[in-house]
């Protein structure tokens, strides 16, 4: 299994972060990150702008090791986690994702990966076995995407350019590619 410890630049340890370049269509109930609290848009923070560029979202740096079975990268890799809800840049709270900025049937702004960078990683194996290098794709920047509450949730699945995403198998975790488990998790994933 993976080395599931991730560190951001504030040295906060958060186990089992979700994947970014090609997310599964189902998110597990027990691994929600930086979850936005439920609640309506605060009435004293009106925002009716249609310009997504006026919105911003959190980019947290996380460091982790790349693993392939018992083999692990010689050095950790660092990538961004696109965190929390989007809000007007001037009003974005310090607390990560503490405010949901959408009104029930109004626009919804999602903080999602925007650009990726590829990195070649050399793995080291116990016992001196020589593994091959691997290429990984890491989130390089985040963006706000404007959705409406009634948009097809598939928009949230297309974080990366790929369409040939695997589906998560039938382990203890929820099965299948199809529509991945519960929508509340999906809505709060970024």
């Amino acid at each position: 299994q993976g080395w599931q410890a991730f560190k951001n630049d504030a040295t906060e340890i958060i186990p089992g972060l979700r994947e970014y370049p090609e997310p599964p269509q189902e998110l597990e109930n027990n691994q929600t990150m930086n979850r936005a609290e439920n609640g309506g848009r605060p009435p004293h923070h009106p925002y009716d702008t249609k310009d997504v560029s006026e919105y911003s979202c959190r980019e947290l740096h996380y460091t982790r090791f790349v693993t392939d079975g018992p083999c692990r990268s010689a050095k950790p890799v660092t990538e961004l986690v696109c965190s929390g809800q989007c809000g007007p840049a001037r009003l974005l709270p310090n607390a990560i994702g503490r405010v949901k900025w959408w009104r029930p049937n109004g626009p919804d702004f999602r903080c999602i990966p925007d650009r990726y960078r590829a990195q070649r990683v050399q793995l080291l194996c116990p016992g001196g076995a020589a593994p091959r290098s691997r290429k990984v794709r890491l989130v390089a920047s985040c963006k706000c995407k404007r959705l409406t509450r009634f948009h097809n949730q598939s928009e949230l699945k297309d974080f990366g350019p790929e369409t040939a995403r695997p589906q998560k198998g039938r382990k203890p975790r929820p099965r299948a590619r199809g529509a991945k488990a519960n929508q509340a998790e999906l809505e709060n994933a970024y």
């Epitope: 299994q1 993976g2 599931q4 186990p15 089992g16 972060l17 979700r18 994947e19 970014y20 370049p21 090609e22 997310p23 599964p24 691994q31 790349v66 693993t67 392939d68 079975g69 018992p70 083999c71 990726y116 590829a118 070649r120 076995a129 020589a130 593994p131 091959r132 691997r134 290429k135 990984v136 794709r137 350019p161 790929e162 369409t163 040939a164 995403r165 695997p166 998560k168 198998g169 039938r170 382990k171």
Partner: antibody, heavy 124, light 106 residues
């Protein structure tokens, strides 16, 4: 649609040279390893080698080392497989494949996108 | 080189029957990946990392195993499942495929 599109079928004579191509569509090949796989008529799959188009670094299976050359042009997102002197035994279907990557707290790699294949026939 | 040996070479079964395909590695590998190939088509990913179901693959397919012995199971064969199946290891160079198992209609 994410896909790999390969060049068309080739009919060549022994001793001739050949270069076949594999173009990435809707993704940049420099972000992935691109592999070449041979399938001789009625036989199984054989891995030939791989390239990292970002810097051109290649790896070959021992049996194909020195027999073929793998290259790429990242500016047009295309990988190539070439022969300087074909033999009748090079008659086969050649596939390119992308080594995809996925992460969910654990790292995964697999050949997720395959080209449609290029048939190479070498006959006098 | 890690040699992957698939057995049986041919499996003759009827629709609705259970198919069990084996892949044995000459030395321990972390994961095995399975591909399906139909005549005139490119291979397609079926199972990755030993037991993970790839996109669009029906739940009747499953994978298991560890170390040197791995299995692909098709719980109830459908007409479209008759094809050739290959296992593959990606962890060590040179990358290798098994020789394939042909699942044919009895």
């Amino acid at each position: 649609e994410v896909q790999l599109v390969q060049s068309g079928a080739e009919v060549k004579k022994p001793g001739e040279s050949l270069k076949i191509s594999c173009k990435g569509s809707d993704f940049e090949i420099k972000d992935y390893y691109i592999h070449w796989v041979r399938q001789m008529p009625g036989k199984g799959l054989e891995w030939m080698g791989q390239i990292d188009a970002e810097d051109g670094e290649t790896e070959y299976a021992p049996r194909f080392q020195g027999q073929v050359t793998i290259s790429a042009d990242k500016s047009i997102s295309t990988a190539y497989l070439q022969w300087s002197s074909l033999k009748a035994s090079d008659t086969a279907m050649y596939y390119c494949a992308r080594e995809g990557y996925y992460y969910d707290g654990r790292d995964y790699w697999y050949f997720d996108v395959w080209g449609q294949g290029t048939t190479v026939t070498v006959s006098s | 080189e890690i040699v992957l040996t698939q057995s049986p070479a041919t499996l003759s079964l009827s629709p609705g029957e259970r198919a069990t395909l084996s892949c044995s590695a000459s030395s321990s590998v972390s994961y095995i990946h399975w591909y399906q190939q139909k005549p005139g088509q490119a291979p397609r990913l079926l199972i990755y990392s030993t037991s993970e179901l790839a996109s669009g693959i029906p739940a009747r397919f499953s994978g298991s195993g560890s170390g040197t012995d791995f299995t692909l199971t098709i719980s109830s064969l459908e007409p479209e499942d008759f094809a050739v199946y290959y296992c593959q290891q990606l962890s060590h160079l040179p990358l290798t495929f098994g020789g394939g198992t042909k699942v044919e209609i009895k």
